[in-house]
Interface confidence: low
């Protein structure tokens, strides 16, 4: 799921202090960020042995996942790193800190610490300001749920090094203009607002200038008030697959839900030659079923060594207290020659999805 190199968001760390126990901190990071979660001991006392947990499973340290008693660092984050993270006391399993982490494509809306976009010596004698990373500034509309941390960035250069200032709805924007203040990171060309609220909605403009000129960029921030909704599903492509006998197949389904969803993978089946029951409800068999703690879950159904009877319609179903959402997936299984012919036909049609 990584972006192409030229588009990739280069790594940057975003350290976030832990919330009060029992509260859930909602955090959004960009793909490629270093996700850094900090959980100081409650009341400043001794921490004792802790364990970091993601979506109910203990995290195993690796080259990419660095686990410490008070801090978790996930390097080069991708969509799969989205989920519910908690730091727990090892003995009691008491949750000390709880974070909901979502990793999206750029731009990141976490904070920025690493100074990676500091003003650089451009090698130009004199020059008006210019954007150094315009590809990072494509997303003009940022819509985030209330309580998230938002960051707007305008990485620029020029000689002499330009200054940056920020406007909100066309007027000078300063920390005292919002509860919770703002962080202006001039060396990272960024404006950071923590725990956004609906009154933070508006147009934010960075003005970058030196004596040779001025450039500006406007972003629109929409803060989504959390109104409960049914789960939202996105089917990972390809939703319909053709597989060769004996091969492995994987279906992807992305589930978004503020309320804890009950997620199921189902398969349509026939009972006594009928696909539906007397009341018209389709017959299904439950392949996987679990409650997700995550606001955004990337769920997969893996079918190994498929046979002809694995063919048919599969369902990804998510239910929360508001409603139900479903996505259908189709699998057709063929012997080697039939599958090759189908792929050739698909190739001629200009679209190949190898099973």
């Amino acid at each position: 799921e990584s972006l192409g190199t030229e588009q990739r968001v280069v790594g940057r760390a975003a350290e976030v202090p832990g919330p009060e126990p029992g509260q859930q901190e909602q955090l959004v990071f960009g793909s490629g960020d270093a996700v850094e979660l900090s959980c100081p001991p409650p009341g400043g006392g001794p921490m004792g042995p802790t364990v970091w947990v993601k979506d109910g499973t203990g995290l195993v340290p690796s080259e990419r996942v660095l686990v410490g008693p008070q801090r978790l660092q996930v390097l080069n984050a991708s969509h799969e790193d989205s989920g519910a993270y908690s730091c727990r006391q090892r003995l009691t399993q008491r949750v000390l800190c709880h974070f909901s982490v979502r990793v999206t494509d750029a731009p990141s809306s976490g904070d920025d610490e690493d100074g990676e976009d500091e003003a650089e010596d451009t090698g130009v004698d004199t020059g008006a300001p210019y954007w150094t990373r315009p590809e990072r500034m494509d997303k003009k509309l940022l819509a985030v749920p209330a309580a998230n941390t938002v960051r707007f960035r305008c990485p620029a250069a020029g000689n002499p090094t330009p200054s940056i200032s920020w406007l909100k709805n066309g007027r000078e924007f300063r920390g005292e203009h919002r509860i919770g203040g703002i962080k202006l990171r001039h060396q990272q060309w960024s404006l950071v607002m923590e725990s956004v609220v609906p009154s933070d909605r508006g147009n934010y403009t960075c003005v970058v200038e030196n004596k040779f000129g001025s450039i500006r960029q406007t972003y629109t921030l929409d803060v989504l008030e959390r109104s409960p909704h049914r789960p939202i599903l996105q089917a990972g492509l390809p939703a319909n697959q053709t597989a060769v006998l004996g091969s492995d197949v994987e279906f992807h389904c992305k589930v978004y839900s503020d309320a804890q969803p009950h997620i199921q993978w189902l398969k349509h089946v026939e009972v006594n030659g009928s696909k539906v029951g007397p009341d018209g409800t389709p017959y299904v068999t439950v392949l996987k079923s679990w409650i997700s703690e995550s606001v955004e879950a990337d769920v997969r159904l893996r079918l190994a060594n498929v046979s002809e009877r694995d063919g048919g319609e599969y369902l990804c179903r998510a239910t929360n207290f508001i409603g139900v959402a479903e996505k259908a997936f189709w699998l057709s299984v063929h012997g080697p020659r039939a599958a090759e012919e189908e792929l050739v036909e698909a190739d001629e049609a200009g679209s190949v999805y190898a099973g």
């Epitope: 819509a143 409960p228 049914r230 939202i232 599903l233 009341d279 207290f321 508001i322 409603g323 139900v324």
Partner: antibody, heavy 122, light 108 residues
């Protein structure tokens, strides 16, 4: 604040078409759906269909399939409902309602337009 | 389609009364039920969602309960502005979204 403002009264002849508009303000239009609900004089509420502003996906009530088309214009934050081949039993007040879910319909309708009376009469 | 049946169809009550309206689904809809209030010439207004959650800005005298197939809307102490028509709506199985036929609450 969130508002849905609908177009005005329409009088149509049987067989004609009507297009009702619903202009949204006070929220990010594309992150929600719009459902259309109608109410014949002295009758209850009847759901007509839904459109996702996010991706243009639609779901229509079976009895209206083929006669109704729902569209949106994100540049003006406006939703439209067109009903063709009008009959006298299409005389009703037509409401648009914000559907709080932008991928599938079925969310409680938290904001409604004021209604548009459509009279079909020869 | 899931059918929603409200009872009674109409009801007379006085200010201060406790009033209960019931809604029955033709099959289980878990807690995916919403209640609306509609006054003559006006659009419906959401009162209760998910069977028992009070919509923001709605007075606390309104409450909802039930799950599965049987649901109730209760107004603990009727106020003059509560005389209206009330509709239940299921959001479990869509399309179609289906409403009850309505309960008209009149002044006795």
């Amino acid at each position: 604040q969130v508002q849905l403002v609908q177009s005005g009264v329409e009088v149509k002849k049987p067989g004609a078409s009507v297009k009702v508009s619903c202009k949204a303000s006070g929220y990010t239009f594309k992150f929600y759906g719009i459902s259309w609900v109608r109410q014949a004089p002295g009758q209850g509420l009847e759901w007509m269909g839904w459109i996702s502003v996010y991706n243009g996906k639609t779901k229509y009530a079976q009895k209206l399939q083929g006669r109704v088309t729902m569209t949106t214009d994100t540049s003006t934050s406006t939703a439209y409902m067109e009903l063709r081949s009008l009959r006298s039993d299409d005389t009703a007040v037509y409401f648009c309602a914000r559907d709080g879910d932008y991928e599938s319909s079925g969310y409680p309708f938290d904001y409604w337009g004021q209604g548009t009376l459509v009279t079909v009469s020869s | 389609d899931i059918q929603m049946t409200q009872s009674p169809s109409s009801l007379s009550a006085s200010v201060g009364d406790r009033v209960t309206i019931t809604c029955r689904a033709s099959q289980s809809i878990s807690s995916y039920l919403n209640w609306y209030q509609q006054k003559p010439g006006k659009a419906p207004k959401l009162l209760i969602y998910a069977a028992s959650s009070l919509q923001s800005g709605v007075p606390s005298r309104f409450s909802g309960s039930g799950s599965g197939t049987d649901f109730t809307l209760t107004i603990s102490s009727l106020q003059p502005e509560d005389f209206a028509t009330y509709y239940c709506q299921q959001s479990y199985s869509t399309p179609p979204i289906t409403f009850g036929q309505g309960t008209r609450l009149e002044i006795k």
